[in-house]
């Protein structure tokens, strides 16, 4: 009998707003057993999948997809997927990542800590959750 | 379908050095952490070392046994991994495999080291 | 460092019969823990993974159970190819740590 998935979390490192030209890491969990995890940009046709999973605690695993340096485009909404076989899981809260100029007036906003739960998450759109395997290569853009 | 296919090994004297690859072919090479593992002959397995990604910056991982002694990198352009080994000694004879994460699923035939006078 | 200790290191049994085989880690692991069979002269090859998870391929009369720092493994009727060599590895930390292998042998 196929296992229930739980829902991945997603958060981003070190925080959700980041200056123009930083980097950022979307830091993707799940359970133990996952052998893809996903990281999904606004879409689903804009994806970057990674094998590179490690512990995050002895019942949790994560991966982490790093942005060296952040430009105005990469300002949207990101979730996260995992696949344990047999089955893909349903994605996660989408979290917002915002973009401000590195120069940074006063009022502009300092950068939030990263957070599975913050207030920059959004509910996601289950309605259609038909996702192939990635080794069956879906095309799709690279979000960076 | 997945090809990991080791190379570089061969006879070698202690304080010596030599250099493994492994060519990768049938995955996406640079979304994997990848292994060393080594066995002894007649013995049983024993983790090398580890590489990880890009988004890892790269992290590297080694065994007690073999630390500040071996090196492991990558070529992510080339599907490559290789280990570099150092003053090696007698009990690094052994059979080497290149192996990919996320669980050890992927291994190599392995390439055969012998460190001796 | 997390030791791996596997038992026993030799097993005899007969075809068609069961064997379980054991590991226990000096520290909790979670489910963080793979099994792997490896032939004479051969690669080894993954079986179980997260403790309990089939890999693709793998004939279903293998299975493993355990969790936290006690986990067994399990040839449920063996057949005459399962007579080799088997290892643990807890995947949660570096140094990922190998048993030290048990040994199936036909009684």
């Known amino acids: 009998q196929e296992e229930d998935l739980p829902r991945p979390s997603i958060s981003a490192e070190p925080g959700t707003v980041i200056p123009l030209g930083s980097h950022v890491t979307f830091v993707c969990r799940g359970p133990v057993g996952v052998q893809t995890f996903r990281l999904e940009r606004d879409s689903r046709s804009t994806y970057n999948d990674t094998e590179d999973v490690s512990q995050a605690s002895p019942s949790e695993s994560e991966a982490r997809f790093r942005i060296d340096s952040v430009r105005e485009g990469n300002a949207g909404l990101y979730r996260c997927i995992y696949y344990k076989p047999p089955k893909w899981s349903e994605q996660s809260d989408y979290l917002e990542l915002l973009v401000k100029e590195s120069s940074g007036g006063p009022d502009s906003p300092d950068t939030e800590p990263g957070s599975s739960a913050g207030p920059t998450q959004r509910p996601s759109d289950n309605s259609h959750n038909e996702h192939a395997p990635a080794s069956q290569g879906l095309k799709a853009e690279h979000l960076y | 379908e997945v090809h990991l296919v080791e190379t570089g090994g061969g006879l070698v004297q202690p304080k010596g050095s030599l250099k493994l690859s492994c060519a990768a072919s049938g995955f996406n090479f640079n979304t994997n952490a990848m292994n060393w593992v080594r066995q002894a002959p007649g013995k049983g397995l024993e983790w090398v070392a580890r590489i990880r990604t890009k988004s890892n910056n790269y992290a590297t991982y080694y065994a007690d046994s073999v630390k500040d002694r071996f090196t492991i990198s990558r070529d992510d352009s080339q599907s490559m991994l290789y280990l570099q080994m150092n003053n090696l000694k007698t009990e690094d004879t052994a059979m080497y495999y290149c192996?990919?994460?996320?669980?050890?699923?992927?291994w190599g035939q392995g390439t055969l080291v012998t460190v001796s006078a | 460092d997390i030791q791996m200790t596997q038992s026993p290191a030799s097993q005899s049994a007969s075809l068609g019969e069961s064997v379980t085989i054991t590991c226990l880690a000096s520290?909790?692991?979670?489910?963080?823990l793979a099994w792997f069979q490896q032939k004479p002269g051969k690669s080894p090859q993954l079986l179980i993974y997260a403790a309990t998870s089939l890999a693709d391929g793998v004939p279903s009369r293998f299975s493993g159970s355990g969790s936290g720092t006690k986990f067994s493994f399990k040839i449920s009727s063996l057949q005459a190819e399962d007579f080799v060599s088997y290892y643990c590895?807890?995947?949660?930390?570096?140094?990922?740590?190998f048993g030290g292998g048990t040994k199936l042998e036909i009684k």
């Open positions: 590895q807890q995947l949660y930390s570096a140094p990922y740590t």
């Open positions: 192996v990919s994460t996320p669980y050890f699923t992927y």
């Open positions: 520290q909790t692991i979670g489910t963080w």
